[in-house]
């Protein structure tokens, strides 16, 4: 069941899913100057069964200047360089997301896709937060949020994370400086904009995650 709204917004923090539950939608969005082909997929869908999940449908973008020219979905080498995967900064042994039942890994890029991805999450989805560059984390609990169903309505749990400027003194000593990450501001309703630049999760956050949804590569 689709979550009604976005994960909570934490000042100076951005969030990321490590794996996507079945039923998750990723809108087929194209970068400026390109558009989704007329009879192309509206979205990609995480789908599958208990043993295997994958993204259904392919997003295809065409130049908005020309008609009926379908661009291939295979990323070119230069694009792959721009969007290189990152290593999980975790002391624990990561598990390949593809092997996690009921979840999909980060979908591969498609040619001329938009710089931001708009996901629509489903009940049970977990997202993880980290402070943006120039801010450090003050943890009071897990830096994560889960979409839950209560009394027939969906809601996201509140992550216990405060991001403070580096110059401010921390009341939680021993916290390490977070890795740099882009500031991705969640949009309203169920749309969650996640920038496609590298997103590195720091060690301390990784330690709060369930090992079952670790991955060695993600955007």
């Amino acid at each position: 069941e689709l979550c009604d709204d976005d994960p909570p917004e934490i000042p100076h923090a951005t969030f990321k899913a490590m794996a996507y539950k079945e039923g998750t939608m990723l809108n087929c969005e194209c970068k400026r100057g390109f558009r989704r082909i007329k009879s192309g997929s509206l979205y990609m869908l995480c789908t599958g069964n208990s043993s295997h999940s994958s993204w259904d449908n392919q997003c295809q973008c065409t130049s908005s200047a020309t008609r009926n020219t379908t661009k291939q979905v295979t990323p070119q080498p230069e694009e792959q360089k721009e969007r290189k995967t990152t290593e999980m900064q975790s002391p624990m042994q990561p598990v390949d997301q593809a092997s996690l039942p009921g979840h999909c890994r980060e979908p591969p890029p498609w040619e001329n896709e938009a710089t931001e991805r708009i996901y629509h999450f489903v009940v049970g989805q977990m997202v993880y937060y980290q402070c943006v560059q120039g801010y450090r984390a003050l943890h009071r609990g897990p830096a994560e949020s889960v979409c839950k169903m209560t009394h027939g309505k969906t809601r996201w749990t509140q992550p216990q994370l405060i991001c403070t400027g580096e110059m401010e003194t921390s009341q939680f000593p021993g916290e390490e400086k977070p890795q740099a990450s882009p500031e991705g501001r969640p949009e309203s309703e169920t749309s969650c904009l996640v920038t496609t630049t590298d997103f590195q999760i720091q060690t301390e956050m990784a330690a709060t995650m369930e090992t079952s949804i670790f991955t060695t590569e993600y955007q």
Epitope: M25, S41, L45, T47, S64, H120, E189, S191, L193
Partner: antibody, heavy 114, light 107 residues
Amino acid sequence: QIQLQQPGAELVRPGTSVKISCKASGYTFTNYWLGWVKQRPGHGLEWIGDIYPGGGYTNYNEKFKGKATLTADTSSSTAYMQLSSLTSEDSAVYFCARVTPASWGQGTSLTVSS
Amino acid sequence: DIVITQSQKFMSTSVGDRVSVTCKASQNVGTNVAWYQQKPGQSPKALIYSASYRYSGVPDRLTGSGSGTDFTLTISNVQSEDLAEYFCQQYNRYPYTFGGGTKLEIK
């Protein structure tokens, strides 16, 4: 919460044009395709076309090309559908709808009558 | 254009019963099918996307299934609030097309 607000009714003369509005709120207007649907008793639901406000891109059902023109004003998060050379066949309820995830406006009842 | 056929225009059922509304596409549409519920004087409300996934707030008594050309919306333990018209829609090929609708009547 997503809302698509449309005027309840429009009464126009045959041969004229009408511009129906659809004001969006509760989501980022420029990031989603917004479609228009016609509903007439006995004719079911018909997809007229859709627009991507972020780039002004449009798709039209061939049947409605020349009849409907879709536009969007991003500054007011409002989509418009202009229907031209109106006849009694155009009398119907017109819905605007965010394409995906789907969410529909309440509809505008258009009556074409002299 | 892809033609969507809802062969049953009307269906009669009783509270507590189970009813299945069917929809047939003239060509393969994968699972790119949505189901809508429309009550008199209201706009259609989205129930199901991608043939089998429920929108938020849709009770789990409503279940979508099917792929390719044949699709079903099943309502188990029918309630009086289910009295409405049900439409399916394909969005696999443009223009997106709808079935003619099935009106559910409660005995």
